[in-house]
Interface confidence: medium
C-alpha cells in the first residue's frame, strides 16, 4: 500500500466513523485534559528540584517508542502532502493514523522499538556500572538513598528523559525538516 492510499484510507475511516465512535476518542482526550488540569492545580514542585536535572551527555539515549518510529516515518509524507499543516495538526493526523493501523502493520515498529529498548537496557546497565561522572554526582541532592528508592528515581528519570528527548528530537526535526 503506498502512502497516499494509506492516508486516504485513514481519513475515509475517520469520516465513516460514527459520532459515537469518534466520541470515544474525544471523551478520552477531554478526560485526560481535565485530569491534567486538575493535577496541575494542586501540583507543588518539590523543594530544591525546580532546577533542571543535570543530564549527562554521555548517558545512553532513551530509545524511541514504536509510535515515535512510526511518526518519524510518516511525518515527512504528511508534511509533503500538506505543507500548510501546523505541527499540532500533523501530530493529530499521525495519532489518527496510528490508531487506525492494524496490529500486524504495527509489528515492525514494535519489534524495532523492543530491540532498541533491549540494547538501551544493556547500555544503561553498563553505564551505571561504570559509575556516573563527577558532574552528575554533583546533581544528586541526597547521596545516601536506599537502593530501591534509587531505582525508582532512575525509572522516573528515564521517563522524563524520554519525554525531553522526544521534544528535543521534534524541535530538531522542525529545524531539519522544514524542508518538506
Amino acid at each position: 500500500v503506498n502512502f497516499s492510499e494509506f492516508s486516504k484510507k485513514c481519513s475515509e475511516r475517520w469520516k465513516t466513523m460514527s459520532a459515537k465512535e469518534k466520541g470515544k476518542f474525544e471523551d478520552m482526550a477531554k478526560a485526560d485534559k481535565a485530569r491534567y488540569e486538575r493535577e496541575m492545580k494542586t501540583y507543588i514542585p518539590p523543594k530544591g528540584e525546580t532546577k533542571k536535572k543535570f543530564k549527562d551527555p554521555n548517558a545512553p539515549k532513551r530509545p524511541p517508542s514504536a509510535f515515535f518510529l512510526f511518526c518519524s516515518e510518516y511525518r515527512p509524507k504528511i508534511k509533503g502532502e500538506h505543507p500548510g499543516l501546523s505541527i499540532g495538526d500533523v501530530a493529530k493526523k499521525l495519532g489518527e493514523m496510528w490508531n487506525n493501523t492494524a496490529a500486524d502493520d504495527k509489528q515492525p515498529y514494535e519489534k524495532k522499538a523492543a530491540k532498541l529498548k533491549e540494547k538501551y537496557e544493556k547500555d544503561i546497565a553498563a553505564y551505571r556500572a561504570k559509575g556516573k561522572p563527577d558532574a552528575a554526582k554533583k546533581g544528586v541532592v541526597k547521596a545516601e538513598k536506599s537502593k530501591k528508592k534509587k531505582e525508582e528515581e532512575d525509572d522516573e528519570e528515564d521517563e522524563e528523559d524520554e519525554e525531553e528527548e522526544e521534544e528535543e528530537e521534534d524541535e530538531d526535526e522542525e529545524e531539519d525538516d522544514d524542508d518538506e
Epitope: S72, E73, K77, Y109, D176, D179
Partner: antibody, heavy 115, light 107 residues
Framework: QVQLQQSGPELVRPGTSVKISCKTS????????MNWVKQRPGQGLEWIGQ????????YYNEMFKDKATLTVDTSSSTAYIHLSSLTSEDTAVYFC????????WGQGTSVTVSS | DIQMTQTTSSLSASLGDRVTVSCSAS??????LNWYQQKPDGTVKFLIY???SLHSGVPSRFSGSGSGTDYSLTISNLEPEDIATYYC?????????FGGGTKLEFK
C-alpha cells in the same frame, strides 16, 4: 553536522553485482528516510528508491525494482544499495540523500561496468 | 510517472546578472517542487523546497516561484560560486522525478 560518507569507486565486470555503502553521522539515522539517486555520465538525476531504517519500509521506482535492493545496518548508521546483473547501462555515479526533501547528499560513488 | 522538463539545457550569463532557470511538469504538481544545485565537482546541494521556500543556509539571492505545471528558479545577482547545474524535482507523486538539468556558465 549531518554527513553522508559514501564508499569508494568500483570497477566491476558485466553480470556481477556491487554493494555501495553510505555511512551517516550527525543525526538520528533511524528516523529519517534514505534515498538513492543515479546519475549516468553527462546525464541528469534519476530517483531509484528510498528506505526508512526503523521499519525497513521501502519505495522503489518501478524502473529499478529488479536492479536495486536497499538495506540498512542501524547499528552502524549505514545505508546500502545492492545492484545486481550489472550491464554498461549501470555505469553511473550513485548518490545517497537524506529524507523526502533530499536535504543532505553523499559525495557519490562511481560504478564502472566494464569487461 | 510525472515528467519534468527543463527546456534550456545550458545558460550563459555574466557576474551580477539576474538569471532564471525554468522547469515544467507534465501535469499539475501543486507546488511540490524542489531545486538542487550540482557543482562541477559533483557535489549536490538542496536549495529550495515547496516551490519558493529557501533551505537553511542558502543565500537570499536564490528564489523560486511558480504554480500548476510551470516553475522557475531565479538567481538575482550571479556570483562565481553559482556556476553549476540546476535541477528541479517534483515530490507530488512517487516516483520522485527530476528535470534534465540546466547548466549555468559564464559568458
Amino acid at each position: 553536522q549531518v554527513q553522508l560518507q559514501q564508499s569508494g569507486p568500483e570497477l566491476v565486470r558485466p553480470g556481477t553485482s556491487v554493494k555501495i555503502s553510505c555511512k551517516t553521522s550527525g543525526y538520528t539515522f533511524l528516523t529519517y528516510w534514505m534515498n538513492w539517486v543515479k546519475q549516468r555520465p553527462g546525464q541528469g538525476l534519476e530517483w531509484i528508491g528510498q528506505i526508512f531504517p526503523a521499519s525497513d519500509n521501502t519505495y522503489y521506482n518501478e524502473m529499478f525494482k529488479d536492479k536495486a535492493t536497499l538495506t540498512v545496518d542501524t547499528s552502524s548508521s549505514t545505508a546500502y544499495i545492492h545492484l545486481s546483473s550489472l550491464t554498461s547501462e549501470d555505469t553511473a555515479v550513485y548518490f545517497c540523500a537524506r529524507e523526502d526533501s533530499m536535504d543532505y547528499w553523499g559525495q557519490g560513488t562511481s560504478v564502472t561496468v566494464s569487461s | 510517472d510525472i515528467q519534468m522538463t527543463q527546456t534550456t539545457s545550458s545558460l550563459s550569463a555574466s557576474l551580477g546578472d539576474r538569471v532564471t532557470v525554468s522547469c515544467s511538469a507534465s501535469r499539475g504538481i501543486n507546488n511540490y517542487l524542489n531545486w538542487y544545485q550540482q557543482k562541477p565537482d559533483g557535489t549536490v546541494k538542496f536549495l529550495i523546497y515547496y516551490t519558493s521556500s529557501l533551505h537553511s543556509g542558502v543565500p537570499s539571492r536564490f528564489s523560486g516561484s511558480g504554480s500548476g505545471t510551470d516553475y522557475s528558479l531565479t538567481i538575482s545577482n550571479l556570483e562565481p560560486e553559482d556556476i553549476a547545474t540546476y535541477y528541479c524535482q517534483q515530490y507530488s507523486k512517487l516516483p520522485w522525478t527530476f528535470g534534465g538539468g540546466t547548466k549555468l556558465e559564464f559568458k
